[in-house]
């Protein structure tokens, strides 16, 4: 029986150009975590395998950093990074647990300030 639960940072926001840590935590189970997949919608960002280490998708390798822990750091954020992110925990013997994070990337306050006072 699957007794575990995934705790996530839930809905988060960050500034364009900045970075953000995506973090999930599996609790209430003694199951062994064998692999964690990080996905954005249906696109793989990264895998952390307990035995093999990290695989960062080549498409994201220049702006995704492994960690801290089983988490993932997204750098050089753009507004296109806004959306749902999923942490998928593969465990033994329980099976698969999935957590969801919604990230909103906002225009920086400097950019907003500049936009308000633009000369027509």
């Amino acid at each position: 029986m699957m007794t575990g639960t995934i705790e996530t940072t839930g809905n988060i926001s960050a500034e364009k150009g900045g970075s953000i840590i995506l973090q999930c935590h599996l609790s209430s189970t003694t199951a062994q975590v064998t692999q964690v997949n990080w996905e954005q919608q249906d696109q793989l960002l990264a895998i952390c395998n307990a035995d093999l280490g990290w695989h960062i998708s080549p498409s994201f390798k220049d702006r995704v950093a492994p960690g801290p822990g089983l988490g993932l750091t997204l750098q050089s954020l753009t507004v296109n990074d806004t959306g749902e992110y999923f942490c998928i925990y593969h465990t033994y013997p329980d099976g698969t647990y999935t957590g969801r994070i919604f990230l909103e990337v906002l225009e920086s306050s400097v950019a907003e300030h500049g936009a308000r006072f633009q000369i027509p």
Epitope: Q35, A50, S59
Partner: antibody, heavy 119, light 107 residues
Framework: EVQLVQSGAEVKKPGASVKVSCKAS????????MHWVRQAPGQGLEWMGR????????KYNEKFKSRVTITVDKLSSTAYMELSSLRSEDTAVYYC????????????WGQGTTVTVSS | DIQMTQSPSSLSASVGDRVTITCRVS??????LAWYQQKPGKSPKLLIY???TLAEGVPSRFSGSGSGTDFTLTISSLQPEDFATYYC?????????FGPGTKVDIK
């Protein structure tokens, strides 16, 4: 076009070491992990280890851990596999193979390097 | 280590035949299984990864299925260039291991 070009055949004495090279081209070398796999004559495939060319971090098959070292030279986009304390059972074709987009499988393979260990 | 078995170890078939190769794994690997084709004196070629995703440039007559511990590679209509040895490989833990291979030759 993705290409992995390996160094030429080697003949070594038992107890010696061998270092095989794998020059990558046609893609960004540091964006893709590299694996090494060997195949003894008439036998199946045996995974030896993998490396992240960006960080230099590596993971090895426990069977080879004490004898194998995988390294990279980022400037020349070349991966290396060194195997020490060679014995006759190490006679095999050694392949480098690029890790795929979506996990720990290999999507492109070098042409192979034959290593013969004989006294 | 995760153990891999393949059946049959060899088979004889004719051009146009439907060919099925099975791979059994000693523990649950979800869908983390790849299939490779190897011809004599050549390097392995990736056919399928994640159990069912066709690699770039691979003809659609190849297909993969299964999850957990039981997997299948199917060639819907065998072509002359398909006579080769086929290997399964899990891509889930250390060490990555391959099946012993299935040799497909001409009947």
């Amino acid at each position: 076009e993705v290409q992995l070009v390996q160094s030429g055949a080697e003949v070594k004495k038992p107890g010696a070491s061998v270092k095989v090279s794998c020059k990558a081209s046609g893609y960004t070398f540091t964006n893709y992990y590299m694996h090494w796999v060997r195949q003894a004559p008439g036998q199946g495939l045996e995974w030896m280890g993998r490396i992240d060319p960006d960080s230099g971090g590596s993971k090895y098959n426990e069977k080879f851990k004490s004898r194998v070292t995988i390294t990279v030279d980022k400037l020349s986009s070349t991966a290396y596999m060194e195997l020490s304390s060679l014995r006759s059972e190490d006679t095999a074709v050694y392949y480098c193979a690029r890790e795929g987009h979506y996990g720990f499988y290999s999507d492109y393979w070098g042409q192979g390097t034959t290593v013969t260990v004989s006294s | 280590d995760i153990q891999m078995t393949q059946s049959p170890s060899s088979l004889s078939a004719s051009v146009g035949d439907r060919v099925t190769i099975t791979c059994r794994v000693s523990e649950n690997i979800y869908s983390y299984l790849a299939w490779y084709q190897q011809k004599p004196g050549k390097s392995p070629k990736l056919l399928i990864y994640n159990a069912k995703t066709l690699a770039e440039g691979v003809p659609s007559r190849f297909s993969g299925s299964g999850s957990g511990t039981d997997f299948t590679l199917t060639i819907s209509s065998l072509q002359p260039e398909d006579f080769a040895t086929y290997y399964c490989q899990h891509h889930y833990g250390n060490p990555l291991t391959f099946g012993p291979g299935t040799k497909v030759d001409i009947k």
